[in-house]
Interface confidence: low
Amino acid sequence: NQDLPVIKCVLINHKNNDSSVGKSSSYPMVSESPEDLGCALRPQSSGTVYEAAAVEVDVSASITLQVLVDAPGNISCLWVFKHSSLNCQPHFDLQNRGVVSMVILKMTETQAGEYLLFIQSEATNYTILFTVSIRNTLLYTLRRPYFRKMENQDALVCISESVPEPIVEWVLCDSQGESCKEESPAVVKKEEKVLHELFGTDIRCCARNELGRECTRLFTIDLNQTPQTTLPQLFLKVGEPLWIRCKAVHVNHGFGLTWELENKALEEGNYFEMSTYSTNRTMIRILFAFVSSVARNDTGYYTCSSSKHPSQSALVTIVEKGFINATNSSEDYEIDQYEEFCFSVRFKAYPQIRCTWTFSRKSFPCEQKGLDNGYSISKFCNHKHQPGEYIFHAENDDAQFTKMFTLNIRRKPQVLAEASASQASCFSDGYPLPSWTWKKCSDKSPNCTEEITEGVWNRKANRKVFGQWVSSSTLNMSEAIKGFLVKCCAYNSLGTSCETILLNSPGPFPFIQDN
């Protein structure tokens, strides 16, 4: 049919942090290159029906379905989803094509289904069908890796029972502390399941698939390092494998290592030793203690002893279920407008947590850092001095934890005024919450010093906008003040701010800001 317009259907995927996308804006913010959905004419259908390629979306993803129409003249349109009509606002791009968009924010099951777009142009009417479904990741899993000894070899196998099968990599580092951060030049990555080089300072195994990345560190006691002030602690759940490595370096091979649990030697078959000469001809020995599936009675102090080094211990605690230990009482903070400040949560958890910081319905990435005492800490500094409620949420396989923070920013009040026929009201969001005064301006009091106390009603903290308190004061109008100028002033420890209002008969009220 020669009259049929040229139709292009595209899918725009928005990055998760794209908070600028509106509910069904005609001008969505493009975050990634649009994907062509084809839009072919559907054969054997009554009327002109175009069908876009099916769209599969991850849960919580944000997308835009967009149609570009190359047809002369104006177009009008209507979206229909699950028998409900949705607003449709076409606009024209630089090439004079009609553009119609449907934005779906944070995809959920309820938003999956058929979206019908009816378009009426001067030449013809036609329908465009989009089918949107949620990508089925229910069967997908990503489990933390664990270690096994390779049969008949001095090597460790890293296993992550995940679907789809993850890519497994060993992350090795031979220097101390900060320089073993993931992107440091001291870090070497080996994408294989078996590791033979087990003498390094820091050994981790990571598994990654479509769901993300999980890592497990090989717990190590280094007899050449000064012991930590608090005893290192290792948590495991019943049934998980236990691996502890004891490492020691000496000038020659004349030393041995042994493992004890609560002063009793570990049973044969629960340890194996390896040794090598380092570049400077010193001898490195490592002794692994392992239990293929731990039980409650494997809890206790594991001590590695050497004939040439002071012994060191670690406390292994076997738990039935994972946990997150932290104080969940809410915390309030009061800071100056330019003061540097970070929220922080100190916690002990097993398995490792996944966490987010949330403010004003927006989520922020959460970083966690291990402390020497077995605790971890997460800090959030990106508050940009916005007052309100901040939420820290953490979870692992077995536990959830939420902690609330309120941030108050100390500042001088800012006053806004409004008036009606019967009253005048002033609002302020300064902090600490301001006190109010009302003054009358008259011939007797040209400087507005005559205080009004009758008919004043103060409401402190009457509404909470994401934790931000607003204070208000209302003056009921009496005959004594009708027709006069009145001044409302809000003051706190940081200053005063006033507004002047003319109380005349009903109608628009002039306000004079007066700081």
Partner: nanobody
């Protein structure tokens, strides 16, 4: 270095069957899991099935019952048996071991 080669694709009528093969070179075959994926025109690559080194199998729920994954470690080959094929099964099918992918084999199901 692992190299993978899929074969067995082709044109088949709806309701028919095909058996895809994934031949691997390299010594790591028996130690690793094998995944099959597929990619239909204009769509993202999607996971189909998996077989672990121990022979345990997992399937995309909507395909379970029609597709069967198996492996023969002696031949360094994995298989995907596809029965009761539908037009929506039309795609390029790929196998994967670790981070290694094959070139893919085209399966077209006509109605």
């Amino acid at each position: 270095q692992v190299q993978l080669q899929e074969s067995g694709g082709g044109l088949v009528q709806a309701g028919g069957s095909l058996r895809l093969s994934c031949a691997a070179s390299g010594s790591t075959f028996s130690r690793n899991y094998i995944d099959w994926y597929r990619q239909a025109p204009g769509k993202q690559r999607e996971w189909v099935a998996q077989i672990t080194s121990g022979g345990n199998t997992h399937y995309e729920p909507s395909l379970k019952g029609r597709f069967t994954i198996s492996r023969d470690n002696a031949k360094n080959t994995a298989y995907l048996q596809m029965n009761s094929l539908k037009p929506e099964d039309t795609a390029v099918y790929y196998c994967r071991i670790l981070d290694y992918w094959g070139q893919g084999t085209q399966v077209t199901v006509s109605s």
